[in-house]
């Protein structure tokens, strides 16, 4: 049997189901990348009038699991939040993605009649904010 | 978002219980005792990130343009994870030993997609 | 049916030691959190500390952390306190209590060893 | 720590009479958190009624329990010669867990 673990505070050792973004812990090579779009790449430049391009992060990056064996717990602190839901479980291989909630909008000036009217429209979730093994 | 059923590959939410006994934590979580967190597996091919209610947002419309497009942005790849999540009520102890009662967000899946 | 077993008395030294035991038995051992209780004669009861036996994590009353111990033995289902360095003051009757869920989040000490108690003389 | 000082410490009362008795914390306590312990002269301590006002099992219905905030209380409603023992409050809120000095119940 193994060696009884330090005492694990509460909350804090929930990052085992909900790591927060900002610890790289054991993935540091799931990161954000930056790249710079136009919305005519995209195609939508009929629609999306302004801005004509934005910077657009997406993450990338491989998800190896190696948790050590006798994993110390983590020190004090509220459960983090934003955090991340349970993956660490039969059968579900981590992946680097966007934090589920954390995605933020763009606001852009739109038509859909060729010009002559505007609208200004919040396009929702396009915005990365944080990267994290899920 | 789909539910696992056996019958599918795609991405879809696995019902799991997780027993805090079995992990060892039932020392400071008090109650529950155990919960069904579920978790997302399955594959997210190029077709299904496009599918409102698929996709986990616009931001994977935008890297499914480049993927048809083959245009390739760092081989992103598809990955399917929990789109929707809930909060549950968690008595535990505090680095003092004092007693908890707190909604922990973030703790259930409750959809899937492909981002 | 859930049982604690506590031997009835132990006579030591000033300034010896003494490891008292608690074995439990009719539930599932490493689930509930086992506490001990002091009573002096005559008087109020005063939480010792608490010990889970599936992880070993012990926490103590701030007053009991120099003189008592709590380790367990799982393969007997059974905790331990040890009291060092004993005085007149640390003649009381020992209990070890089980911490229970008695459901909708509710949690006491809901099963009592019958304690042992101890005589600090010389 | 929380203080819970129990009033009165020793209590006489006739048989049939309505009995009440308070425990007062120096800081206030979840309701949730606070237990009753009976205990008989020569035996362990019993739970009694737990999270304020629920009896525990096999507790008669004459006793019952409430409070709030740094005020409980535990009341009988006919006072029968077999309550006439020791009662304990306790709280479980905040580390150390602390007890009351007791209440000694006996009969007029």
């Known amino acids: 049997s193994t060696p009884p673990m330090s005492w694990p505070w509460s909350p804090s050792a929930l990052r085992l189901l909900q790591r927060p973004p900002e610890e790289p812990a054991a993935h540091a090579n799931c990161h954000r990348v930056a790249l710079n779009i136009s919305f005519q790449e995209l195609g939508w430049e009929r629609w999306i009038v302004y801005p004509p391009s934005f910077i657009f992060h997406y993450c990338h990056g491989g998800c190896g699991l190696h948790i050590p064996p006798n994993l110390p717990l983590p020190v004090p602190g509220a459960p983090p939040t934003p955090a991340q839901p349970p993956s660490l479980l039969p059968g579900a291989q981590p992946c680097c993605a966007a934090l589920p909630g954390t995605m933020r909008p763009l606001h852009v000036r739109t038509t859909s009649d060729g010009g002559y009217s505007f609208k200004y429209e919040t396009v929702p979730n396009l915005l990365t904010q944080h990267c994290a093994c899920i | 978002g789909l539910e696992c059923d056996g019958r599918t590959n795609l991405c879809c939410r696995q019902q799991f219980f997780i027993d805090f006994r079995l992990i060892g934590w039932n020392d400071w979580i008090i109650a529950p005792t155990g919960y069904y967190g579920n978790y997302c597996e399955g594959s997210c091919p190029a077709y299904l990130a496009g599918v409102p209610g698929s996709a986990s947002s616009f931001h994977t419309a935008v890297v499914n343009q480049y993927r048809m497009r083959g245009l390739n942005p760092g081989a992103v790849n598809s990955c399917c994870i929990p789109t929707k999540l809930s909060t549950m009520s968690m008595l535990y102890f505090d680095d003092e030993y004092n007693i908890v009662k707190r909604d922990v967000p973030n703790m259930i899946v409750e959809e899937c997609g492909c981002a | 049916q859930v049982q604690l077993q506590q031997p009835g008395a132990e006579l030591v030294k000033p300034g010896a030691s003494v490891k008292l035991s608690c074995k439990a038995s009719?539930?599932?051992?490493?689930?509930?959190?086992m506490y001990w209780v002091k009573q002096r004669p005559g008087q109020g009861l005063e939480w010792i500390g608490m010990?889970?036996?599936?992880?070993?994590?012990?926490n103590y009353n701030g007053k009991f952390k120099t003189g008592a111990t709590l380790t367990v033995d799982k393969s007997s289902s059974t905790v331990y306190m040890q009291l060092s360095s004993l005085t007149s003051e640390d003649s009381a009757v020992y209990y070890c209590?089980?911490?229970?869920?008695?459901?909708?989040?509710?949690?006491?000490?809901?099963?009592w060893g019958q304690g042992t108690s101890v005589t600090v003389s010389s | 720590q929380i203080v819970l000082t129990q009033s009165p410490a020793i209590m006489s009362a006739s048989l049939g009479e309505r009995v009440t008795m308070t425990c007062t914390a120096s800081?206030?306590?979840?309701?949730?958190?606070f237990h009753w312990y009976q205990q008989k002269p020569g035996s362990s301590p019993k739970l009694w009624i737990y999270?304020?006002?629920n009896l525990a099992s096999g507790v008669p219905a004459r006793f019952s329990g409430s409070g709030s905030g740094t005020s409980y209380s535990l009341t009988i409603s006919t006072m029968e010669a077999e309550d006439a023992v020791t009662y304990y409050c306790h709280q479980y809120h905040r580390s150390p867990w602390t007890f009351g000095g007791g209440t000694k119940l006996e009969i007029k």
């Open positions: 800081s206030s306590v979840s309701s949730s958190y």
């Open positions: 009719g539930y599932t051992f490493t689930n509930y959190w």
């Open positions: 209590a089980r911490w229970g869920y008695g459901g909708n989040y509710d949690y006491a000490m809901d099963y």
């Open positions: 999270s304020t006002s």
């Open positions: 010990i889970h036996p599936n992880s070993g994590s012990t």
